[in-house]
């Protein structure tokens, strides 16, 4: 018995085609992905395979404007329109609270949305009882395929599912919903989750009775064969796992942003054993076009996009400096706005002992591509936070040795004075650089503020320490030089829509004037 | 091989009454939520009520509460729909379905997702 399994992952938001690097679309006959063609490929695919399963791997939330005007209702809308048979929940689902999961997606969704290590308590239990599932059994053709989810346990930490959600160890929740798919004589069963790859190829290595392993959170991108476009695999699709009791488990992840339709065609036999798997991520390019009906309908639904992207956020009362005259050479006050929009945007009490788990933020001066004026009565929109962040990136996580950090400083203004966007802004960090040493050895003073205090105060940073900070996904990736950050990440997860960070920051205070206040001092 | 088969349709008055009953072989209907649903001709199947394994929970839809009632016996491994007081707009082929999954009775009937197990049907016909 053949099975097919289409599947996404972190689509974040992309419901339009995209440019190739999954920003705004520019050039539309060079634009890719976008659920109006992801339609045409899947229905194409459901219209020649008897036996085909849709499944989204999670973090459809959050990552464009389309998310911060409808706030889960178009994940809903689309993906019903689509006819995905299940989805995991993941971190991000939960960026607008757990109310921001149950109202648009949950009590919307037509197809289930799984998490077997989510445990709901207190009087959160018997609201969201039902709404989200820790397996389900779907029909498939004459056969009958369990689907069990998980997600992220870092999730209190990457966004705010509350305190009323409990996330388990992954394996040690999937183990028991797996064990009681095989009692029901539920023979082929998927895992569909959301914790990264390392994670996915544990569950295929640990949990008894997993078939295939489907996953997201990490962006893998996994391809046999010569790859299509930019991205580079991080191994064979599928990933084979050799399990503790000695079978092979398929294991796929397709990247992000709804660029490709992950394809994987599994043979069982009839006991429900994976004979085979083959299969490889399909770029959806512009060779495939857009489905007419759903195109319309994202038409009808962009409407009020437009409208919010002039309307005004809150005002201030200073000029926002976002020029290279500064940010490049200087502390200015919109790194100083931004950086502090980041690290609000992470507040997170999750131990008492701790008045946050992060404190510190750092952003390539590069990155800051425009002023706002406050002369236009104060306004701020959406539109003019476009101008400032116009690369549709995103503000992540990592975690970083001490030494790690001080290098990142060093390449800051190693090569000082010549306009280059390296030179770092700063939240929760005290520098000082003297510029008449030699690159390598300019920064004289690094103090960072504690996150394990009562009262925040600037310590001395400590090489060996590991410290988590906030920062824009292009500086994780090792962009601008900043070799020294991809290479050397301990820990990296994917955050918010860099604007829709600032926007959500400025909507809060609704009157900002940001200062110049010696977070950079050159001695 | 698993199989759910229902039994006790056929012809009635209307107000009169019918017992409708689907047993199950190849598998334990205690872990399955169960729902009776039907099918009337030129219209679309919908659910009529349903119980989980559990705690035994049930729900009806609107058209038939009161008049009907849903029961099982885990012992016989089977599920029963109680219908009295019918009606002619309750001519429909009445089909019993199964789910292991832990949806609720709720979701379980609208049929909010798909359902893996399905009888093959009986004919409940109200006619004088």
């Known amino acids: 018995w053949e099975l097919t399994i289409l599947h996404t992952n972190d689509v974040h938001s992309r419901l339009e085609q995209t440019s190739e690097d999954s920003s705004k679309c520019v050039n539309a006959s060079r634009c890719m992905g976008g659920v109006a063609r992801l339609f045409t490929k899947v229905q194409q695919i459901r219209r020649a395979e008897p036996n085909v399963l849709l499944l989204d791997a999670g973090d459809q939330y959050q990552g464009t404007i389309w998310f911060t005007v409808y706030k889960g209702a178009e994940v809903a809308h689309f993906m019903n329109a689509l006819r995905y048979d299940a989805m995991a929940l993941g971190n991000h689902e939960f960026d607008n609270g757990v109310e921001g999961l149950i109202e648009p997606l949950l009590k919307e969704a037509k197809f289930p949305i799984l998490s077997a290590n989510i445990k709901a308590k207190g009087p959160l239990a018997s609201q969201i009882s039902g709404l989200y599932l820790p397996y389900k059994v779907l029909p498939v053709g004459d056969e009958v395929v369990g689907i069990v989810g998980y997600t992220s346990k870092e999730t209190p930490f990457l966004s705010n599912p509350g305190t009323n959600l409990v996330f388990e160890d992954e394996i040690t929740a999937l183990q028991p919903e797996v064990d009681k798919l095989k009692t029901l004589n539920v023979n082929k069963i998927i895992a569909l989750g959301h914790s990264g790859f390392e994670m996915d190829k544990l569950i295929a290595q640990k949990v008894r009775g997993v078939d295939v392993v489907v996953g997201g959170h990490s962006n893998t991108f996994l391809y046999t064969g010569n790859p299509p476009s930019k991205e580079v695999p991080a191994g064979k699709y599928p990933f084979i796992v050799t399990s503790d009791d000695g079978r092979k488990v398929p294991v796929v992840q397709a990247y992000a942003f709804g660029k490709y339709l992950g394809y994987l065609k599994i043979e069982f036999d009839e006991r429900g054993n994976v004979i085979s798997s083959h299969g490889n991520p399909i770029l959806l390019n512009s060779s495939i076009p857009e489905d007419p009906s759903i195109k319309a309908d994202i038409n009808k639904w962009r409407i009020k996009l437009d409208n919010y992207s002039t309307q005004e956020l809150g005002k201030t009362i200073v000029y926002l400096d976002g020029s290279s005259q500064s940010c490049r050479f200087r502390e200015c006050n919109m790194g100083n706005l931004i950086c502090d929009a980041m690290i609000n945007n992470n507040l997170r009490h999750t131990d008492e002992m701790f008045w946050n788990h992060v404190s510190m933020c750092i952003l390539n001066g590069g990155g800051i591509r425009s002023p706002i004026d406050e002369r236009n009565n104060g306004t701020i929109t959406w539109e003019n936070l476009a101008a400032v962040l116009p690369f549709g990136g995103t503000f992540d996580l990592v975690q970083l040795k001490g030494s790690t950090l001080k290098k990142a400083f060093e390449h800051s203004v190693h090569r000082y004075g010549q306009s280059t966007g390296e030179f770092l802004q700063v939240g929760g960090i005290h520098v000082v650089y003297d510029l008449s040493r030699k690159p390598g050895d300019r920064v004289v003073k690094l103090d960072v503020l504690c996150t394990k205090c009562r009262v925040p105060s600037y310590d001395p940073l400590k090489m060996d320490e590991v410290y988590k900070v906030i920062l824009p996904n292009f500086l994780a990736n090792g962009g601008d030089g900043f070799q020294m950050i991809k290479d050397e990440l301990l820990r990296h997860d994917s955050g918010d829509q860099d604007i829709n960070v600032v926007s959500t920051y400025i909507s809060k205070m609704k009157v900002i004037y940001p200062a110049v206040e010696g977070r950079i001092k050159f001695s | 091989q698993r199989q759910l088969v229902e039994s006790g349709g056929g012809l009635v008055q209307p107000g009169g009454s019918l017992r409708l009953s689907c047993a199950a072989s190849g598998f334990l209907l205690d872990y399955y939520v169960i729902g009776w649903f039907r099918q009337a001709p030129g219209k679309e199947r919908e659910g009529v009520s349903c119980?989980?394994?559990?705690?035994?929970?049930?729900y009806y839809a609107d058209s038939v509460k009161g008049r009907f009632t849903i029961s099982r016996d885990n012992s016989k491994n089977t599920v029963y729909l109680q219908m009295s007081s019918l009606r002619a707009e309750d001519t429909a082929v009445y089909y019993c379905?199964?789910?292991?999954?832990?949806?609720?009775?709720?979701?379980?009937?609208?049929?909010?997702?798909?359902?893996?197990?399905w009888g093959q049907g009986t004919l409940v016909t109200v006619s004088s």
């Open positions: 119980i989980s394994g559990s705690d035994r929970s049930t």
């Open positions: 379905a199964a789910d292991p999954s832990p949806v609720t009775v709720q979701a379980m009937c609208l049929p909010r997702f798909p359902v893996p197990y």
